[in-house]
Each structure stands twice: as C-alpha cells, then as structure tokens.
C-alpha cells in the first residue's frame, strides 16, 4: 500500500534570464528511494538523480540545469519557454512511483517575484 | 584505457555459492559505478545489481536475498557472490563500469565475460 | 519491472542497404534508453545513450530516436562490421532492464 505525500513547490513565478529551483519532498512512507526523476512539461528527462550513484544531467539540458540542492533542481538562464509543468517522479522500493507537480510560469517583468511555497499537489 | 577482468570457477555445485572476483585496470573504483551483468545461454541481458564509488549497493529485487557485491579498494576489484544457486543461474557474468554522470544507466565498459554452469 | 520487447528478433540485410531495430517499452520511460552491439564472441558495446546520443567512437551512419515507449535504432548504410545482436535498455526506473535483442546479420 502507497501511503507516502509528495509536497512540491507548487506553483511559482520567476524572472526571464533569472534561475528558480524546483523542489520536491517525500513523506509519511518507509520505502526507500532509488531514483528521482525530474521531468519537463513535455515529457522530456531534465535530469536523474540515482539513490547509489548521483546525479545525471540529461545532454540537452547540461549548460542550463544544476543539481540540488538536496534532490531538487535548479533551471537557469530561464527563457518564456520554460513556462509550463515539470514533475518530480520518486521511484521507491517496495512502494512503487510517487509523483509531484510544480507548475512554472516566467515572466518577461523585472518585478516578476519569485514565489515558492511548499503545498501537496 | 579502463579494462575489466573477471575471473572465479567456472562450474558451480546446486544449492552452493557463486563468487566471482573483477580485477579492474586503468581507473580506480572509488570512482563511478561498477556493476554484475548477466546472460543466460541463448536468452538476454539481465541486471544483477551495482556497487557505487562510496561503496552503496543496489541489487536487482529479483535476486537481492541472495546477492552480495563488496569491493576491495586496495586490490581495485570487486565481488559478486550469488547463494543456493540453480541451473537458472547457468549464465556469461559481466562485470561492468557504469559512468552515471555522464551516460545515465547505460554501461560505457563492459569485462569479456566469464561462464559459469550450475551443475552436479 | 520495466518490459522491452524488440522487433525484429533477426534482420538480415543487404550492405550498403538500410536497417531499422525497434524497441517498446511496457511503460513511459521517457528518454533513458540506451542501445548495445553484441559483436560475435564479444562483450557488448554502448552505442546509443539517452536515446540519440551516439556514444565516444561510434560512427554517424547509426543514429536512436524516439521517447516515451517507442524507440528505433537505425543504421543509415549496413556494414559487414555491423554484426551481431542489438540490445536496448531503459534506466528510466531500478531495476534496469533490457530488451531480448535483434539479431543482425548480412546477406
């Protein structure tokens, strides 16, 4: 039985050309983790951080996208087109796939402010 | 250029152990990840699990209550040890690096492979 | 755990013509696949990682695409060095799994 909670940084606002970090967290369960994914609004891999081995940056994403910190994601030099939905997927043992949504919007505004608060999806 | 060596019996009894040892060349194991891969006669690749350059384990669920992999910096190898084995684990066993960071899960260096029958 | 089914089991071609292996995952495993040669005799050899990325040495008529379930190698121009048996893989999720292989040989 999956009793674990995802909490994310929900829906957040940042700059054009500024960086936002994206930050999953899960709870109330006992499996242990392998991996976390982290994925775009596309579907496409950002990166994959394994429970043994660390962290791999997909090759599309390298100049843009830092680890952490701790198992969230820093994007950089953000551009309009980030705007959209990214997903934490957690990958446990014995639980099986947990998986949060962060919703990202970037803003052309110079006082676009960078809101991130921790809510459950 | 990074060269893995497996070596150990190739003929192992019913319901006994099955240790094979990876001497590995030109890179050093507290680096990267270092994996047991293998395959049975005539069928596909299997996972057998890793050891990581801090020295963490992960072993494939389907093996894990009876799979150890250790290493030994000293030496630059590592082990497998596979208990209560069967004719099911009749297979070619490669040892293997894995550089995490810059190709993900996909195997970069690969041992020759050394085979090894479960029979009485 | 993860399924990859590979089609087609064997694959005989002409050199000089091209060739085409697909791969299905039995879930979205996004991009994380990579593809291996199994020369006759040999160990296997990385060829595709991520996907679409050629691996270090690997020459330009072998090229991977696709995401989610579906993904195919394809070899531009076959060659008689380009011999053996083709295994994808996922690292989408542990355990890692590969696929039963394609088996490639000349005509």
């Known amino acids: 039985m999956m009793t674990g909670t995802i909490e994310t940084t929900g829906n957040i606002s940042a700059k054009k050309g500024g960086s936002v970090i994206l930050q999953c967290h899960l709870s109330s369960t006992m499996a242990q983790v392998t991996q976390v994914n982290w994925e775009q609004h596309d579907h496409s891999l950002l990166a994959i951080r394994n429970a043994e081995l660390g962290w791999h940056i997909y090759p599309a994403f390298k100049d843009r996208v830092a680890p952490g910190p701790g198992l969230g994601l820093t994007l950089q030099s953000l551009t309009m087109n980030d705007t959209g939905e990214y997903f934490c997927t957690y990958h446990t043992y014995p639980d099986g796939t947990y998986r949060g949504r962060i919703f990202l919007e970037v803003l052309e505004s110079s006082v676009a402010e960078h809101s991130a608060r921790f809510q459950i999806p | 250029e990074v060269q893995l060596q497996e070596s150990g019996p190739g003929l192992v009894k019913p319901s006994e152990t099955l240790s094979l040892t990876c001497a590995v060349s030109?890179?050093?194991?507290?680096?990267?990840?270092w994996n047991w891969i293998r395959q049975p006669p005539g069928k596909g690749l299997e996972w057998i699990g890793y050891i990581s350059y801090s020295g963490n384990t992960y072993y494939n669920p389907s093996l894990k209550s009876r799979v150890t992999i250790s290493r030994d910096t000293s030496k630059n190898q590592f082990s497998l040890k596979l208990s209560s084995v069967t004719a099911a684990d009749t297979a070619v066993y490669y040892c293997?690096?894995?550089?995490?960071?810059?190709?993900?899960?996909?195997?970069?260096?690969w041992g020759q492979g050394t085979t090894v029958t479960v029979s009485s | 755990d993860i399924v990859m089914t590979q089609t087609p089991l064997s694959l005989s071609v002409t050199p000089g013509q091209p060739a085409s292996i697909s791969c299905k995952a039995s879930?979205?495993?996004?991009?994380?696949v990579a593809w291996y040669l199994q020369k006759p005799g040999q160990s296997p050899q990385l060829m595709i990682y991520?996907?679409?990325y050629r691996y270090t040495g690997v020459p330009d008529r072998f090229s991977g695409s696709g995401s989610g379930t579906d993904f195919t190698l394809k070899i531009s121009r076959v060659e008689a060095e380009d011999v053996g048996v083709y295994y994808c893989q996922q690292y989408y999720t542990t355990p890692w799994t590969f696929g039963g292989g394609t088996k490639v040989e000349i005509k």
């Open positions: 030109g890179y050093s194991i507290t680096s990267d990840s």
């Open positions: 991520s996907a679409s």
């Open positions: 879930q979205n495993v996004r991009t994380a």
């Open positions: 293997a690096r894995l550089d995490f960071s810059n190709y993900g899960g996909a195997v970069d260096y």
